[in-house]
């Protein structure tokens, strides 16, 4: 007669997290009397998963009624599978005794759990950088299995190549994490740009997960400054304009200095956006030439996004404008950003 065989027909079984896993096991004989037990792993540290004889195993149910006469099917179903359930499961026949004696083990069935990666989280640099500088973006996704995964970076739809990606741990694990860093060279046109981290995995059925970051959070576009003088008005007043253009973000403070002394400070707010996402701002200053004996040095000082101030100066030539007697009275304030100098 043939001796007892414990048959586990599948070498491996792959199950999606949250589903049930069926682990098949049949025996070739009902002799000798004694229980079947299921273990995860082998050796002294193995973990008891199910014992027909005794115990309470809420997530494990026998596929066939184990109390049925002539039952030789000791397959089990494990519900609500998580990555922690991955491993090799052994169906083991014991011979009745005190204690029961292990008689024969099946060859084992490796349970692998297909777990979806978490939504990729993209984080950018802690501080802003200007055009021509390189900034790093990091993308992280966790909890996936199996280990094989693909991660791609895109900037405005174009794949990035300066990328470094690691999947951890390197060895076998119940689940894995991916971390990738992309280096992006900024341009002045990147205020509206976006980087996308795209993760593809077998569990996603061809529908990759994406995480995004806006370069507007990472970029600083410093302003251009231009100070100009409009033509002399009939009332001996000169209109001086400071044009601050193509800057981002909007956080900007403008200070007018007259011969080195602070004349007025303004904060930019509610500015209209340019097509490229940058901002422009114009500030005017009315200078009453007749109130000055000497030339006036006007300075437009701009502090942008907490950076060191940028200055642009302009000299109003008083000698070029003959004074009118009694003209040292205040001129009218004719615009929001206009102020008279005495």
């Amino acid at each position: 007669e043939e001796e007892l065989q414990v048959i586990q027909p599948e070498k491996s079984v792959s199950v999606a997290a949250g589903d049930s896993a069926t682990l098949n096991c049949t025996v070739s004989s009902l002799i000798p009397v004694g229980p079947i037990q299921w273990f995860r792993g082998a050796g002294p540290g193995r973990e008891l998963i199910y014992n027909l004889k005794e115990g309470h195993f809420p997530r494990v149910t026998p596929v066939s009624d184990p109390t049925k006469r002539n039952n030789m099917d000791f397959s089990i179903r494990i519900s609500n599978i998580t990555p922690a359930d991955a491993g090799t499961y052994y169906c083991v026949k014991f011979r009745k005794g005190s204690p029961d004696v292990e008689l024969k083990s099946g060859a084992g069935t490796e349970l692998s759990v297909r777990a979806k990666p978490s939504a990729p989280v993209v984080s950018g640099p802690a501080v802003r950088a200007t055009a021509e500088h390189t900034v790093s973006f990091t993308c992280e996704s966790h909890g996936f299995s199996p280990r094989d995964i693909t991660l791609k970076w895109f900037k405005n739809g174009n794949e990035l190549s300066d990328v470094q990606t690691n999947v951890d741990p390197a060895g076998k694990s119940v689940s894995y994490s991916i971390r990738s860093t992309a280096r992006v060279v900024l341009t002045r046109r990147d205020v509206h740009s976006q980087v996308i981290c795209e993760v593809a995995h077998v569990t996603l059925q061809g529908d990759p997960l994406r995480g995004t970051a806006n370069l507007s959070e990472a970029i600083r576009v410093p302003p251009f400054l231009e100070v100009t003088q409009q033509s002399m008005r009939a009332d001996n007043q000169v209109n001086v304009t400071c044009q601050v253009t193509k800057f981002y973000p909007q956080r900007l403070q403008l200070t007018w200095l007259e011969n080195g002394n602070v004349s007025r400070t303004e904060m930019a707010s509610a500015l209209p956006e340019n097509k490229d996402g940058t901002y422009n701002w114009t500030s005017w200053l009315l200078v009453n030439v007749s109130a000055h004996r000497d030339d006036v040095k006007l300075t437009c000082q701009v502090e942008h996004d907490g950076q060191p101030a940028v200055n642009k100066s302009f000299s109003v030539k008083v000698s070029a404008h003959p004074k009118e007697q009694g003209s040292n009275t205040a001129a009218e304030n004719t615009g929001t950003n206009e102020r008279n100098i005495y």
Epitope: E1, E2, E3, L4, S28, S29, L30, I31, P32, V33, G34, P35, L52, K53, E54, P66, T67, R69, N70, N71, M72, R95, K96, G97, S98
Partner: antibody, heavy 115, light 111 residues
């Protein structure tokens, strides 16, 4: 699906006998065959179970005197050094207890030990 | 070795009666459930009724039920029928595979 015993009869004290249990309608290869006896007017008494070669076991009182073997269709039990108190109807049944209970049973064969 | 004590050894009952037979083991049976019940009529082989303490064998009427665990077990016939008059045996299994012992039997007779 049934079991049929044979081989019973009259035997002298100290003698031997070989009982057979033949299955029809099913194979014995994956099942144990257990033997139970019943002395006249008494209750049932478990003797032992015949499995494969090494998986054959007998109640402590029957060890040494009773042995067994099995093919895919027939189980045998050898009775030796018979005594008058071994007089009984001998039943065979498929199964080895616990989750493999004794079912079905043969009709029984009478063994009489007398001089 | 395990010992099985069955009670009562005999009882008289009428058709329709509820009948309870008990079986006590000298130690916990194997797996707390290695207990079977058999019915035997005169001149016939025993017939399996219940195994694993409470599992009804195929073809056995549902008026038969088994309960218990460890050392104390019960066979109940909810409504005795004329064909139920017979002798009932429990069979308990100890931890050793050859340690299978029948109780002394309970003869159910017509009152």
């Amino acid at each position: 699906r049934q079991l049929v015993e044979s081989g019973g009869g009259l035997v002298q004290p100290g003698g031997s006998l070989r009982l057979s249990c033949t299955a029809s309608g099913f194979s014995l290869s994956s099942h144990g065959i257990s033997w139970v006896r019943q002395a006249p007017g008494k209750g049932l008494e478990y003797i032992g179970t015949i499995g494969t070669g090494v998986i054959t076991y007998f109640a402590s009182w029957a060890k040494g005197r009773f042995t067994g073997s099995k093919t895919s269709s027939t189980a045998y039990m050898e009775l030796s050094s018979l005594r008058s108190e071994d007089t009984a109807v001998y039943f065979c049944a498929r199964g080895s207890a616990w989750n493999d209970p004794f079912d079905p049973w043969g009709q029984g064969t009478l063994v009489t030990v007398s001089s | 070795a395990i010992q099985m004590t069955q009670s009562p050894s005999s009882l008289s009952a009428s058709v329709g009666d509820r009948v309870t037979i008990t079986c006590q083991a000298s130690q916990s049976v194997y797996g707390n459930n290695d207990l079977a019940w058999y019915q035997q009529k005169p001149g016939k082989a025993p017939k399996l009724l219940i195994y694993l303490a409470s599992t009804l064998a195929t073809g056995v009427p549902s008026r038969f039920s088994g309960s218990g665990s460890g050392t104390d077990f019960t066979l109940t016939i909810s409504s005795l029928q004329p064909e139920d008059f017979a002798t009932y045996y429990c069979l308990g299994g100890g931890d050793d595979e050859a340690d299978n012992v029948f109780g002394g039997g309970t003869k159910v007779e017509i009152k």
